[in-house]
Structures are given as C-alpha cells and as structure tokens.
C-alpha cells in the first residue's frame, strides 16, 4: 500500500522537517527557517511559535517540530501548550477577580496556583486532630480517642478535602 | 494600527523619581488592563505592576512595595508607572502591556518596545 501510495502521491516521500514544493516539481524541500513540519508528506511547513512578552522558551524550534512556551518566573501556564501564563499567588492564597486574596478561615491551599480547599474534617473518620491547619496547611488527623490506649501511636495523613471549591469571598 | 509607547525613563540617582508614561493609540484603554514588566540586563522579564480597566492595583513584584504605584487617565488614553526611592536594582527596560485582566496574559496582548531606566549609585 505504501508503495501504490508513493506512485500516486510524490508528496508522501517527504519526510518529516521538509515540505513538498509543488515550485520545484514536488521536490522535497527543507522548511525554511522559523518553520516545521512535524510529519511527513506536507505541503507547507507551519510558522515556529515565538515565546515573547511573558512567554519565555522551553524548548527551540526545530525543523520537525515546534518550540515550546512557559512561563516568566510568577506567573505558570494554563491552557493546552501553554497559551496563557496566569499569575502566581502565594501559597495559603488563591487568585480571585480582585487579585490573590488570602484563604478564608477553615480553609488552605499548599500551593502557588489553585484554589483554597476546605481543611480536613477527621471527625468524619472519627479521628481527632492532631496539628491544626492554617492557611497554607491542611490539618493532620490523628488517633480518636478511644484509640489512644498505650502502644498506639499511628498517625494518620490527612483525607483529602472532600468538596474543593472557592472559599465565600 | 494598535500601538503602546512607553516614555519618561532615563538615567536617575538612587534615592530619585521617575514618571514613566504608557500611551495607547489605535484601541481605547477604557476596557483593558494594563500591566508594567522590567528585564534587567541578563536576567528574565518580571512583572512589576498592573492596573485593571476598574482601577484596582495588582503588585506582582514584592520589592517595590510602597515605591511605586499605577495610575490610569483613560481620557489621555496613558498609564503612568511612578517610581519613587529608585535603588540600582531597579535598573532594567520597563514595558507596559495590556492584558484583558491583569492576572491572565496571552499571546495576543499588545506590548510595547520598552523604555530604558538607569539607577546609579
């Protein structure tokens, strides 16, 4: 099939990195700088992507595939590829319309993106708490009670949260 | 044709003032945000300011925390990046932008070609 392809289509011997230059008698070309094409048999070659303004590069341009963005240091993607660089907040943070705004009591975010989560409840699991949370910390859940007889020291990580949502601003 | 022109930089002491300016022409500022970025020689682009279409202030930068401040005078259709207590590490090319909000930026937002600040010591 490839090759009865091949003799009906010159195009699809082009490999990846050139184009197929119907000026030139369909002769594989190379892409011309700033340009890829990322498989093979392509009529053109497509524009490299530029990481400008608050783009920076990850990784160049080369003639078979396309540069890769991120983002100027406080601020990190968001969008396929990349497309936009969204701010960094602090952690205990989360980024509202206004701007980052602390998390609200009862509620935490450990990172620099996201939002604030409510802290765990170990009451649920029947446990107590052992350390409390903070803005940037959930709670760590320990022991109940009852269970604290001698030789149980277990220490339970905490449950994740079990709604995520915005905290009421 | 959409364009921002930054001006007012130049060489200060530390300890001095400048006033740089962000003019839009082409598209009205009443709508957009517009934010202000610094790239010092060798280092990456930071951001330092921005100000939305309703005037609220977003402080990207810690460091220049009560120095400088963002005001807009959409009549004019300009920003204006006032820069007191200039240190040497303020020294770099400051840009303004204009997002649609200033905590998101895309590749379609207008940037301008920057203005050069120089703090000597």
């Known amino acids: 099939f490839e090759r009865t392809r091949s003799l009906q289509d010159p195009c699809s011997n082009c490999p990846a990195g050139t184009f197929c230059d119907n000026n030139r008698n369909q002769i594989c070309s190379p892409c011309p700088p700033n340009s890829f094409s990322s498989a093979g048999g392509q009529r053109t070659c497509d524009i490299c992507r530029q990481c400008k303004g608050v783009f920076r590069t990850r990784k160049e341009c080369s003639s078979t595939s396309n540069a890769e963005c991120d983002c100027t240091p406080g601020f990190h993607c968001l969008g396929a590829g990349c497309s936009m660089c969204e701010q960094d907040c602090k952690q205990g943070q989360e980024l509202t319309k206004k701007g980052c705004k602390d998390c609200c009591f009862g509620t935490f975010n450990d990172q620099k993106r996201g939002i604030c989560r409510p802290w765990t409840n170990c009451s649920l699991d029947g446990k107590s708490v052992l350390v409390n949370g903070t803005k940037e910390r959930d709670v760590v859940c320990g022991p109940s009670p009852a269970d604290l007889s001698p030789g149980a020291s277990s220490v339970t990580p905490p449950a994740p949260a079990r709604e995520p949502g915005h905290s009421p601003q | 044709q959409v364009q921002l022109v930054e001006s007012g930089g130049g060489l200060v002491q530390a300890g001095g003032a400048l006033r740089l300016s962000c003019a839009a022409s082409?598209?009205?500022?009443?709508?957009?945000?517009i934010g202000w970025f610094r790239q010092a020689p060798g280092k990456e682009r930071e951001g330092v300011l921005c100000?939305?279409?309703?005037?609220?202030?977003?402080i990207y930068a810690d460091s220049v925390k009560g120095r400088f401040t963002i005001s807009r005078d959409n009549a004019k259709n300009t920003v204006y990046l006032q820069m007191n207590s200039l240190k040497p590490e303020d020294t770099a090319v400051y840009y303004c932008?204009?997002?649609?909000?200033?905590?998101?930026?895309?590749?379609?937002?207008?940037w301008g070609q920057g203005t050069q600040v120089t703090v000597s010591s």
């Open positions: 932008v204009a997002p649609r909000i200033c905590s998101t930026y895309s590749s379609d937002d207008y």
């Open positions: 082409g598209f009205t500022l009443d709508y957009s945000a």
């Open positions: 100000i939305s279409s309703s005037g609220d202030v977003t």
